[in-house]
Every structure is written in structure tokens, then in C-alpha cells.
Interface confidence: low
Amino acid sequence: HLIVTPSGCGEQNMIGMTPTVIAVHYLDETEQWEKFGLEKRQGALELIKKGYTQQLAFRQPSSAFAAFVKRAPSTWLTAYVVKVFSLAVNLIAIDSQVLCGAVKWLILEKQKPDGVFQEDAPVIHQEMIGGLRNNNEKDMALTAFVLISLQEAKDICEEQVNSLPGSITKAGDFLEANYMNLQRSYTVAIAGYALAQMGRLKGPLLNKFLTTAKDKNRWEDPGKQLYNVEATSYALLALLQLKDFDFVPPVVRWLNEQRYYGGGYGSTQATFMVFQALAQYQKDAPDHQELNLDVSLQLPSR
């Protein structure tokens, strides 16, 4: 059900492209195609190509993206295109100028001197931005989101975008300086992952990140469960980055217990993040044979 045909405006097309990209990434990383039929992979890649080609129609001369060509470009949407395209680079042919042009626009046009990324044209489909929606810690949350996208494009765009390392450092400085004041678990998780990617989630910041977890297994705010799945997925990625394998199993267990398989209205970010995190877990966890994840089963498996 995650392999769908993308269509619509520059936002809807990304909503449609997301589940297919992340499903292929997950099945590739976890080597599970045989369960679903290897022949389905080619069809999925065709849909990703289609989504990519369609998205280019919403690329503006500045290299940024918007729902429509004549609409002001969105920081969040452009960063999200960077994130999805960076993941898709290993799946289909993606023009690095498209990807790195968007990165350059984010840095030159949307990053303030203090490192913050600003949004001047919010997306129409607010349901696609997940836990960033109505977030009163907007500067931190959006800066973390963009920073994660930039870091995922770093290997591809470092040579083409000279200002990329400096931009990443500056955004990291801002997150680090304001991290201890965060109130929302979602922002703690997303900013925690952005800092962990840079090796800067340590000391009091790491302590705050870990103690924000409810019952040591989830990063949760009152309200939508989808946002909690998304936040906990960011947190899991941070833990894997930190190689904190003692904290990992309860978190994976909680995500598994949510029985969240992606898809549905407003699920874009939760879908992307939960499958990205679980794929990374499959790659990084030291030993699936002994790690205890099977709470839903009375009998241990292996």
C-alpha cells in the first residue's frame, strides 16, 4: 500500500512520492524484497522516476520549489525535496544540479546570520509537514529539519556548494545554543538528531535528549500520535548515530508496538521517518539475534 502513483501540485506530488521512495529504501536496506516479490521493485522505481520528473515542473528559476510555479517558494518544501531526492539518488538518476541548486538556494536565500532557516511561504498542505505543524518552537524545529536535509545532501553537494559546511556549522551552533530551552519532545527529538549527526549531542544536551523520553521508550507530546511516531523515529536515528544500543531496544519495541505501516492523510512525515529509522536500525544494531524486540509475541523468536 506504500507503493503509489505520485500526482498533483508540487506538494501533492511529494506526498505521493514519499511512501514509494521510503518503501524501496527500506526493502533495499533490510533485504526484504523477496518477501514482496523482486519484480515489484522495478515498477516502484518507475513510479519514483515519474514523481521526480513531475517534481521538476515545480522547480523555479531560483532552483527552489513551490506548490505551483507562480507561488513563492517554500523553505520547508525545498528542504523536503532535498531530503527525498538525496535518498533517491541511489535508486534513480537524479541531476545533482537540481539537488544542489536547491541546497544553495536554502543557504543563500533562507539562512539568517544566526544560522536559523526562515519560512516565508508556508506550504498549502500543512498536513504534510508532520510535527512542525503549529509548532511554537518553529525556529528550532524548521532549522533542525533543514539541517538534516543539508546533511543528507552533504556528500553529493559539498563540491558544488562551497558554503555548505559553514552553513551546517552555523545551523548547528544555533540548535546547540537553544537546545536546553526546548519544551516540546518533538523538537528535542528532531534537533537532537540534527546535532547527533554532527557529533554535537553530548553532555547536558544528551542528558536532556535522553530524559525527555517517556518511559525511556518514546518522545511524546499531547495530541497527534502520528507526530509522536515521527518524533520517536528521529530520536531512534539519533540513538543509532550515538551508538547507544542500550537505549535502542525499548524505542524500537515501542515503534513496533504502534503497528504503524504508513500511508493515510497527514502521514507523510511519520511514514518517511519511521521507515528510515527502522531501516537504519536493521543496518546498525549490533545483533538482531539477541536484541529483545518481540514484545507482541509471548515466545522469543531467535
Partner: antibody, heavy 111, light 112 residues
């Protein structure tokens, strides 16, 4: 430092029961299954069963069903194995592993 | 039950020389999740076993990289590139794909 500390050696009479312990430290107890393994003198290893410390779920080797009972006490991060109706065949060293290994508990059954 | 057969029974090696131990299973150890749950243990004289390798080829932390595990399906090998004095003991392979888990009979590595 990760450790599985097992209880000391025991000498028991045939027909009796024995309960040995395996106390985990240095890691989160519920994160890893605890396996129990038997090693008879100068012989290879035999898998007895496994317990999930999170919920107490167990799976046994058919050969040891009715012979071994696996339990855990989460509050003390300790796993237990009870062996009943002991015979000389049960004389062996018993290890717990998680995948770290305990130092073993020697059981001698003798009248 | 899956039978694990190790060869040789005893291996006499000169320090600094390579060593190789074979482990064959009576059924494929490839699990439905795509992973192969084959482990290698070392039991030094008078000590408890210690895991060296899991998932066929992944080294446990602290295990020297002179140890390598390889194989797939039913045939597996543990190699030591240059044997050192601390490597002596009994090596066991064991599988965690099928219940009950089963161990090989062991290979005793002695220093010539």
C-alpha cells in the same frame, strides 16, 4: 562492565531440585534474551531454552521440557533456572548467556 | 533438530601460522528475515565460552581482526590469519535460526 554473575556450585542428592541464578549487570536487563546452556564434563554444549526478560516468555528444547523451568525477576535483573528430579545425567556445568556468558554453575548429583 | 558438524576435531598449529575450522549444518541457516544466525564461540581452558562472531561474519567488540567468519546456507568457516598463544581452546559453532538452537561438537585448537 557487562557481567552475568551465576550462583555457586551445588552438590545435591538424586531426586532433589536445584534453582540457580544469573544476575545481570552493566546493561539493561530487559534488552537481551537469556539463554541457558548445559555442558556435561568434557562434552559439547547443549541448549536448554531461552527466556524473554521483558515479558517472561520462554521457549524450551523439547529434551529439557519438564526438567528445566526458566523464570526472571526484573526488579533484581536476575534470571533463574530450576532443575527438578535430578539424576546423575544432570551433573554438568550450566551457563546463562545474553550474548555475554556467565561463569557457569556446577551441579553435581550424587548420593 | 539441526545437526552442526565441525571439522577437524583437533587442530595443531604453530604460532604465527593460519588456522581454519569448518562447520556444516544439516539444514540451511538462512532465515526468513534474510539473515543467517550462525555464531562462533571460543572456550579457553577452564573458562566459560565467549562469543567471537555472530551473523556469520560480524566480529564481537574486542575480538581481534585476525578472526574472520564466512559462509552461507549450510557451509561455514572460521579462519584465524595468524594464530597467537591466547587463541588456544575449543571453538564451537552454533545456530540460532531453528529451534532448538544447536551447537557443533567443538574443535580443539592446540599450539604445536
Amino acid at each position: 562492565e557487562v557481567q552475568l554473575q551465576q550462583s555457586g556450585p551445588v552438590l545435591v542428592k538424586p531426586g532433589a531440585s536445584v534453582k540457580m541464578s544469573c544476575k545481570a549487570s552493566g546493561y539493561t536487563f530487559t534488552n537481551y534474551y537469556i539463554n541457558w546452556v548445559k555442558q556435561s564434563h568434557g562434552k559439547s554444549l547443549e541448549w536448554i531454552g531461552v527466556i524473554n526478560p521483558y515479558n517472561g516468555g520462554t521457549s524450551y528444547n523439547q529434551k529439557f521440557k519438564g526438567k528445566a523451568t526458566l523464570t526472571v525477576d526484573k526488579s533484581s535483573s536476575t534470571a533463574y533456572m530450576e532443575l527438578n528430579s535430578l539424576t546423575s545425567e544432570d551433573s554438568a556445568v550450566y551457563f546463562c548467556s545474553s550474548p555475554y556468558w556467565g561463569q557457569g554453575t556446577s551441579v553435581t548429583v550424587s548420593s | 533438530d539441526v545437526v552442526m558438524t565441525q571439522t577437524p576435531l583437533t587442530l595443531s598449529v604453530t604460532i604465527g601460522q593460519p588456522a581454519s575450522i569448518s562447520c556444516k549444518s544439516s539444514q540451511s541457516l538462512l532465515d526468513s528475515d534474510g539473515k543467517t544466525y550462525l555464531n562462533w564461540l571460543l572456550q579457553r581452558p577452564g573458562q566459560s565460552p565467549k562469543r567471537l562472531i555472530y551473523l556469520v561474519s560480524k566480529l564481537d567488540s574486542g575480538v581481534p581482526d585476525r578472526f574472520t567468519g564466512s559462509g552461507s546456507g549450510t557451509d561455514f568457516t572460521l579462519k584465524i590469519s595468524r594464530v597467537e598463544a591466547e587463541d588456544l581452546g575449543v571453538y564451537y559453532c552454533w545456530q540460532g535460526t531453528h529451534f532448538p538452537r544447536t551447537f557443533g561438537g567443538g574443535t580443539k585448537l592446540e599450539i604445536r
